[in-house]
């Protein structure tokens, strides 16, 4: 079964502390989207309890093997189902948390009840507020039957489910007539798909015998132990606050697992933690009982004394369950619960023995799980005990399961039951995939989906050039990093495959598909140098370069130029596609702008050493503003405008140009050209009387600049209409004198 | 498909016995609370008596209590209804009738309701 | 004992229409309690309303309940012709388990 446990914080005082958390112990869980594992889920199911909509609860991932779900606002939003999927692939599996309120008017005796196929099933609900009204029961959230409240037994509802089977698994329910469904007390039933002590697709195999409250797998026949217990069939106890298949687990808090509840995969459910019970799993067990739920009674024998968590603690010269068994008796010793071996492998398999007498080679057998029985090769005796050695013969899948080792002695006789997992090595499904390439290196990501199992332990990359008959070059990498196939031949085809291996003798799996990478072509090695470049406009540049004289045909299919506009952050890139151009103009740049400019030779996608680079300072487009705009009237029909030149000019002005716009006007603006750059002052004739105009104005060299602050001015007076506003200039100081 | 189908009705003198039956089918009739409920020619339904899905628990209107017996076979899925000491006012079309049991909204109670009947059988007690 | 009680006893209206049914409990009842029927002549009830104001499985939406502590309605906003039938309000009780109204006619004017 899969290592997934839900834990639920029951101490509920206050329903902003109560939190469920979800653990893996899964190699590999919830690492999320790589190829090795799904994340884990865990989530409020609705579709059964409906609850009154609230704020979303928060989910908390610590690590890959951990969730945790918070932000309960109100009891009502704990009330219902939850669940915690975890595991990959077959192995995805759902634990299912059913939770009820302290408050509810009906309350479970019990909450999971895991039950054989055929068995009768009675879930019983307690009165806890009283009503006198009909009790609905429902399953999976639909009418299932109904009871009068005269029928209550000893203050109890009861729901006999005769001859279950698997279908009739879910979630139950049972609810006072006027009651809300909240206040419904609600169970689990899970309906194993055998019979008692059977597995197997026709429950035809028998379980191992789980102990200590284990239940028995319908489907593999795996033991699911209960909280606090591990082994293959639950037969030994962790140690107190720990939990998980190999016990790796540690209960969170200082009280250890008290006021948890654990769910587990079915066929289990839930219970309270090893050594503690009650409807909250905050009483710790009576004396005589242990376990989960304190379900099991010590019974302990020959001085043995009973530990709420492990059960009975024996005392020197006896061991068994109930300190029944004398250490005289033989006794099967260390033997691992699960082992596990690749398919068509021959391991060897040790069994140790002690008692008295001595077991010797004879008296220990193995036997597998078709009966098959194996003998001893050899033995190696020790003053404390014998171990047996046993060849196996070469494994196959039908292999897996439980096998027994056997110790018969005049003493007695004791055997352990182990599980052999059968594993098949793994076989990419697909081929690797290129990332990147060079002439002489391919970059390879060998991460590819496989059949068979895993956990992977090694990749290897083999490689040869295509369609060649030498060996093969291997090389072996890290599962989840990127490979470099490096001091290969440019421009050569190279058919490469994976093979993956999972631990153990024979995990090497089957080779993968081959695909075929390619390198690039060499790159070239000649760098150019800029002979020189001049500047043909505000926004254009000539490049000329040169190359060294070298013997031989030239490495290149062209030039690529780049200039990078340091104020802007931004790169133009100019590709000249031939290998014999030797000068290129660059055209829509920006003016005034400061550029580096380097060329480099390409061949293929490959690129060359780049020229020492130069600086260009490319001319702005226009001069600055004119300087202290000024508007004056002079009639009824006459603006005079005076300005002072631009600082700083790159070269001489050509013109000036005026813009004038009656203010507040919704009509275009008038430009008008100063054909005098040498002026500073101009008349604008054919104005209307009593206007308000806006004026502004800009200098142009070889492109227009930038504006002049806009002023305002009135012209005077009641005069007529005039045609349009025309200009006429001086000189600053003879439009003064006038 | 549910269907409910009564029997037995007829004629009776006053004072005589009758028993009818229900026949259900499409559904598990053992999980089921059962009613009847009869109408008086051109009058309206009037609940004669009810019976639990185990049948430890019957319920009875006044005006039958003492001389109607209610009771079911699971096995068979037939309901009963035993009439003694029958009187002209007995007289009407007996209907047997399904409780079910509805979530009235997301989240509020549950609402019963007689979702099937049957086709009526008529009892006519008269000299 | 708690009664139900409807009005009016006789409705006359014509299709298209709209159609209002009221029943009064004797005294305050749990809403989801309250259920109404449509009988046919020659023919058995059919539940239409169950919890006052839910729709059985199958009613046309032109149906709805309403209401809640004594007074109930049953509203048909466009009257078809296979409208035209007894109406009855029906309580689930404790004792008698099964109440019903007295029914209204609603018949084509």
């Known amino acids: 079964a899969v290592d997934l446990t839900l834990l639920a914080n029951l101490r509920l005082t206050d329903p902003q502390r109560f939190f469920l958390t979800c653990v893996s112990g899964e190699a590999g869980a919830g690492r999320g989207s790589d190829a090795w594992g799904p994340p884990l889920l865990l989530e409020k199911d609705d579709r059964i309890v409906r609850t009154p909509p609230g704020p979303p609860l928060r989910l908390a991932r610590n690590g890959s093997h951990q969730v945790t779900l918070r932000g309960f606002s109100k009891p009502s939003d704990l009330v219902g189902v939850f669940s915690c999927v975890g595991g990959a692939g077959a192995r995805r599996t759902r634990v299912i948390y059913v939770h009820n309120s302290p408050g509810a008017h009906l309350l479970p005796d019990k909450v999971t009840h895991t039950v054989n196929k055929g068995d009768t099933a009675v879930l019983s609900a307690r009165v806890h507020k009283e009503k006198q009204t009909d009790v609905i029961w429902k399953s999976n959230g639909s009418y299932f039957y109904t009871l009068d409240w005269h029928e209550a037994q000893d203050g109890r509802f009861l729901l006999q489910l005769p001859n279950v089977q698997p279908p009739s698994s879910g979630i139950y329910s049972a609810t006072y007539l006027e009651a809300s469904p909240l206040g419904s007390a609600f169970f689990r039933l899970i309906v194993r798909g055998c019979g008692a002590g059977r597995w197997g697709p026709g429950c035809t195999k028998e379980c191992p015998g789980c102990l200590h409250g284990g239940v028995c797998h319908d489907h593999d026949g795996e033991c699911v132990c209960p909280p606090g217990f591990t082994g293959t069939r639950c037969e030994q106890a962790c140690r107190e606050g720990r939990f998980g298949q190999s016990c790796q687990e540690q209960c969170p808090g200082i009280s250890g697992c008290r006021g948890l509840t654990f769910c587990l995969p079915d066929p289990y459910g839930c219970s309270c933690g090893s050594g503690w019970r009650g409807s909250q799993c905050q009483e710790a067990c009576a004396p005589g009982h242990f376990g989960a739920d304190c379900r099991l009674q010590c019974q302990c024998q020959n001085g043995g004394t009973c530990d709420r968590f492990s059960g009975c603690v024996c005392p020197s010269g006896w061991h068994g369950v109930h300190c029944e068994k004398s250490d005289r008796i033989p006794q099967i010793l260390n033997m691992a619960s699960e082992l596990e071996f690749n398919l068509e492998t021959m391991p060897r398999i040790n069994c140790a023995a002690a008692g008295n007498p001595f077991p010797v080679r004879g008296s220990i057998e193995l036997r597998k799980p078709d009966g098959t029985v194996l003998l001893s090769t050899k033995a190696i005796v020790e003053p404390e005990k014998t171990t047996a050695e046993f060849e196996v013969p070469r494994l196959v899948l039908a292999d897996s399961g439980f096998w027994e080792c056997r110790v018969s002695t005049s003493g007695g006789q004791d055997s352990r039951r182990f599980k052999v997992n059968v594993k098949v090595p793994p076989v990419p499904l697909a081929a690797p995939r290129l990332l990147t390439k060079q002439s002489r290196q391919l970059v390879v990501s060998p991460l590819v989906s496989f059949s068979g199992d895993g956990p992977i332990s090694t990749v290897r990359l083999h490689y040869r050039p295509q369609d060649s008959t030498m060996d093969w070059s291997t090389i072996v990498v890290d599962p989840s990093e990127n490979v470099t196939l490096m001091n290969l031949r440019p421009k050569t085809g190279y058919s490469v495959r994976v093979q993956l291996s999972r631990p153990g003798e024979g995990g090497e799996g089957a080779w993968g598909p081959p695909t075929l990478m390619t390198t690039d072509c060499p790159e070239p090695l000649l760098q150019p140098w800029l002979e020189g470049w001049h500047v043909e406009g505000t926004d254009r540049l000539r490049v000329s370069w040169s190359l060294p004289l070298v013997p031989g045909p030239l490495v290149g299919d062209g030039f690529l130029l780049r200039l990078w506009d340091g104020t802007r952050g931004q790169e133009r890139r100019e590709n000249v596609s031939s290998p014999q151009a030797r000068t290129a103009l660059l055209t829509g740049l920006t003016p005034g702008t400061h550029y580096q400019l380097d060329v480099q030779l390409y061949h293929c996608t490959l690129l060359g050493p780049a020229s020492p680079p130069a600086h260009v300072l490319l001319p702005p487009s226009g001069p600055p503003a004119p300087r202290h705009l000024h508007a004056q009237a002079l009639s009824d029909s006459e603006i005079q405008l005076t300005w002072k030149h631009p600082e700083a000019l790159p070269g001489p002005i050509s013109k000036y140009v005026v813009e004038v716009q009656v203010a507040g006007g919704a009509g275009d603006p008038l430009w008008i050209d100063v054909d005098r750059p040498e002026e500073t002052s101009t008349i604008i004739r054919g104005l209307n009387a009593s206007t308000r105009y806006l004026f502004r104005m800009r200098a142009s060299i070889q492109g227009l600049g930038d504006w002049s602050n806009t002023v305002e001015e009135s012209t005077l007076g009641n005069g007529l209409q005039a045609e349009g506003p025309v200009q006429e200039s001086r000189a600053a100081e003879e439009g003064l004198d006038q | 498909e549910v269907q409910l189908l009564e029997s037995g009705g007829g004629l009776v003198q006053p004072g005589g016995s009758l028993r009818l039956s229900c026949a259900a089918s499409?559904?598990?009739?053992?999980?089921?609370?059962m009613m009847w409920v009869r109408q008086a020619p051109g009058k309206g339904l009037e609940w004669v008596s009810g019976i639990y899905p185990s049948g430890g628990v019957t319920l009875y209107a006044d005006s039958v209590k003492g001389r109607f017996t209610i009771s079911r076979d699971n096995s068979k899925n037939t309901l009963y209804l035993q009439m003694n000491s029958l009187r002209a006012e007995d007289t009407a079309v007996y209907y047997c009738?399904?409780?079910?049991?509805?979530?009235?909204?997301?989240?509020?109670?549950?609402?019963?309701?007689?979702?099937?009947w049957g086709q009526g059988t008529l009892v006519t007690v008269s000299s | 004992d708690i009664q139900m009680t409807q009005s009016p006893g006789t409705l006359s209206l014509s299709p298209g229409e709209r159609a209002t049914l009221s029943c009064r409990a004797s005294r305050s009842v749990i809403i989801s309690y309250v259920a109404w029927y449509q009988q046919k002549p020659g023919q058995a009830p059919r539940l239409l309303i169950y919890?006052?104001?839910t729709r059985a499985t199958g009613i046309p939406d032109r149906f709805s309940g309403s209401g809640s502590g004594t007074d109930f309605t049953l509203t048909i906003s466009r009257l078809e012709p296979e409208d035209f039938a007894v109406y009855f309000c029906q309580l689930y009780g404790r004792s008698p388990r099964i109440i019903f109204g007295q029914g209204t006619r609603l018949e084509i004017k």
């Open positions: 499409g559904f598990t009739f053992s999980r089921y609370t």
């Open positions: 919890g006052a104001s």
């Open positions: 009738a399904r409780v079910n049991y509805y979530d009235s909204s997301g989240y509020g109670p549950i609402a019963p309701g007689l979702d099937y």
